[in-house]
């Protein structure tokens, strides 16, 4: 593991990353749950959507989210004009025309209705911390991840590589 400076190093170029092409390389419909198997659910309340983290009853159907995967070129650290590698960015849409957005000022995760092209706040860098878990890092705020706080989704700052594996930023994707 590479310590705090390493986290800053691998996130600093996110601002400069460019999404290659406007269409996703693939799309994947999945239910989203926390590391502790609580479900992420979406409810329409007063013409806006609320996001909840909750235990579902035994036969209760899980909400699905459409994950759209985009390739993003990552500039080379050395020269600035080369490409060091590729990242996967995702957008998450639980219902037509609504996407998860990072509200960095409020440290919150919100559902916004918007048209394409989507704003940068709707894009999240996809991380695998474990073989069966993913994390979502804000494109607009490197080092900040979607996480669980008080039974809601929130934005959580991760300031060291040890904290990258903290359970509250780990999520499971399931087709069932």
């Amino acid at each position: 593991a590479f310590g705090i400076s390493g986290v800053q190093k691998y996130t600093r170029a996110l601002h400069d990353s460019s999404i290659t092409g406007i269409s996703p390389i693939t799309e994947y419909l999945a239910s989203l749950s926390t590391y502790n198997d609580q479900s992420i659910t979406f409810a329409l309340e007063d013409e806006s959507y609320e996001i909840y983290v909750e235990d579902l009853k035994k036969d209760e159907k899980k909400d699905k989210v459409l994950l759209s995967y985009y390739e993003s070129q990552h500039p080379s650290n050395e020269s600035g004009d080369g490409v060091d590698g590729k990242m996967l960015m995702v957008t998450l849409s639980p219902t037509k025309d609504f996407w998860l957005h990072a509200n960095n000022k409020e440290h919150s995760v919100e559902l916004h209705k918007c048209e394409k092209p989507l704003p940068d706040q709707a894009f999240f860098v996809l991380h695998n911390m474990h073989s069966n878990c993913v994390s979502f890092e804000c494109k607009t705020d490197p080092g900040v991840f979607i996480g669980v706080k008080d039974n809601h989704l929130a934005l959580i700052k991760v300031d060291s590589s040890e904290n990258l594996c903290t359970e509250n930023i780990l999520f499971k994707l399931s087709e069932t």
Partner: antibody, heavy 122, light 107 residues
Framework: EVQLVESGGGLVQPGGSLRLSCAAS????????MTWVRQAPGKGLEWVAS????????YYPDSVKGRFTISRDDAKSSLYLQMNSLRAEDTAVYYC???????????????WGQGTLVTVSS | DIQMTQSPSSLSASVGDRVTITCLAS??????LAWYQQKPGKSPKLLIY???RLQDGVPSRFSGSGSGTDFTLTISSLQPEDFATYFC?????????FGGGTKVEIK
């Protein structure tokens, strides 16, 4: 240019140990999951071990679990495979591979080393 | 574990032929499927990832398709340098698994 260079292969007796190394260059090593894949003579490809980009997680198939250990040294941009209690069926060319994307396992293995041959025989 | 069954295990074809290789998974998964080409004494080379994405530098005569449990690699017009062994690989669930390979030989 991305380069992966394996070393450490050779002839070893059953029950013996061997440590393979993979020297990586041409990319930001600590941003990638790394994986060992092997190929027995005249056979197909078999996944051997994977390690997360942080080094915090390691994964193995049942065939090597408890005998093989994958590790990484980001300061040296190096990947390792410690192989203990070797068996005749571990005889294979061992390849070091790199994931396609930063931080992620998705998208196959675009970069492979030249491979190093491990022969387990008495 | 997800078993990947490739067919045929070998085939003979001529330059210019259209060649199709299939990979059948024992259970459905997201489209994290890759295809590799390997020539004798060489390391495998990634051709296709995400079931249908062409890896940089790979000729456009190679294409991939499929989802769920059925995946296909197609070579639209076989070239002399395409005679090799081809492997599929799923990356969706651990343990990662490869197909048994398809050897494409000259007729």
């Amino acid at each position: 240019e991305v380069q992966l260079v394996e070393s450490g292969g050779g002839l070893v007796q059953p029950g013996g140990s061997l440590r393979l190394s993979c020297a990586a260059s041409g990319f930001t090593f600590n941003n990638y999951w790394m994986t060992w894949v092997r190929q027995a003579p005249g056979k197909g490809l078999e996944w051997v071990a994977s390690i997360t980009y942080t080094g915090g997680g390691t994964y193995y198939p049942d065939s090597v679990k408890g005998r093989f250990t994958i590790s990484r040294d980001d300061a040296k941009s190096s990947l390792y495979l410690q192989m203990n209690s070797l068996r005749a069926e571990d005889t294979a060319v061992y390849y070091c591979t790199r994931a396609n994307y930063y931080y992620n396992t998705y998208g196959g293995f675009p970069y492979w080393g030249q491979g190093t041959l491990v022969t387990v025989s008495s | 574990d997800i078993q990947m069954t490739q067919s045929p295990s070998s085939l003979s074809a001529s330059v210019g032929d259209r060649v199709t290789i299939t990979c059948l998974a024992s259970e459905g998964f997201s489209n994290d499927l890759a295809w590799y080409q390997q020539k004798p004494g060489k390391s495998p080379k990634l051709l296709i990832y995400a079931a249908s994405r062409l890896q940089d530098g790979v000729p456009s005569r190679f294409s991939g398709s499929g989802s769920g449990t059925d995946f296909t690699l197609t070579i639209s017009s076989l070239q002399p340098e395409d005679f090799a062994t081809y492997f599929c690989q799923q990356g969706s669930k651990y343990p990662l698994t490869f197909g048994g390979g398809t050897k494409v030989e000259i007729k």
